[in-house]
């Protein structure tokens, strides 16, 4: 059985205020069963950015159809970027558990920073 890897190919993503940012994340295995969530930051202070299962995240759309059985692409787009959105974003795999899912593995993170507007 192949060990799950969380791949976030970009270490740094330069974005423009007001535009849409695409954060890439793919997994190498469908196991263990459980959701992939997106966070900004690490530790107890991290911000939940996207959870497919619950909540309403109006600025976030997924690149792929997460409901497809064999989907391994958990990339997201965040629209209407502001300076308050800068930080490092992590896709995190959770293992299905009872009563709560358990964090299993995190991607290496993608730092989102503001780039100069194109002239």
């Amino acid at each position: 059985e192949e060990e799950l890897q969380m791949i976030q190919p970009e270490k740094l993503l330069l974005v423009t205020v007001g535009k849409t940012a695409t954060l890439h994340c793919t997994v190498t295995s469908l196991l263990p069963v459980g959701p992939v969530l997106w966070f900004r930051g690490v530790g107890p202070g991290r911000e939940l950015i996207y959870n497919q299962k619950e909540g309403h995240f109006p600025r976030v759309t997924t690149v792929s159809d997460l409901t497809k059985r064999n989907n391994m692409d958990f990339s997201i787009r965040i629209s209407s970027i502001t300076p308050a959105d800068v930080g490092t974003y992590y896709c995190v795999k959770f293992r299905k558990g009872s009563p709560e899912n358990v964090e299993f593995k995190s991607g290496p993170g993608t730092e989102m920073a503001l780039g100069a507007k194109p002239s």
């Epitope: 911000e47 109006p58 209407s80 300076p83 308050a84």
Partner: antibody
Framework: VQLVESGGGVVRPGESLRLSCAAS????????MNWVRQAPGEGLEWVSR????????DYAESVKGRFTISRDNSENTLYLQMNSLRAEDTAVYYC????????????WGLGALVTVSS | ETVLTQSPATLSVSPGERATLSCRAS??????LAWHQQKPGQAPRLLIY???RRATGIPDRFSGSGSGTDFTLTISSLQTEDSAVYYC??????????FGGGTKVEIK
Amino acid sequence: VQLVESGGGVVRPGESLRLSCAASGFSFSSYAMNWVRQAPGEGLEWVSRINSGGGGTDYAESVKGRFTISRDNSENTLYLQMNSLRAEDTAVYYCAKQYDWNGFFDYWGLGALVTVSS
Amino acid sequence: ETVLTQSPATLSVSPGERATLSCRASQTVGSKLAWHQQKPGQAPRLLIYDASRRATGIPDRFSGSGSGTDFTLTISSLQTEDSAVYYCQQYYYWPPYRFGGGTKVEIK
């Protein structure tokens, strides 16, 4: 969406009070929450914010070191522990749900009146 | 720190007339500006977000416009129930979240 504050009352300067905000009608654990206050006859003043998981907090300078925001996601409840209260803390305190992690306040509670007076 | 200045402080408008409220930011806030309505003795209620998007259930007589530093809330045909204080809020830079000082709309 419903937000109901409780715990307000009359206290003397230097005393403490804890406000609660019971949330229902939405996935509480997915959203950042805030406290906003309004002194009598005045405008709105943001007090504090807590992130969805409860580990990240921010405070207005006027309350830093005296107030502590917290949440219990299993009970769908937001708290504001207010210590060393001053007369200028007298206000209606509203809890407010945040639209997303970096956003405006889309739902407000009815408010709890806190009066600090000797 | 971004300061929001609302004008006028008080606006008296006859029923059926147009009310125009202004909110000016001390530095750009992009389109990240919301408007809240607060009726006497009640909690605030979200009207407009992202400068021009109406919140759920808000009548279409309320509209928002502007970007950068200058924003406008327009009530196209004032109703008696629109008597309230209106606050703008920016969420481009935070913390802290900032509100304007408010505009009180009175019915003539």
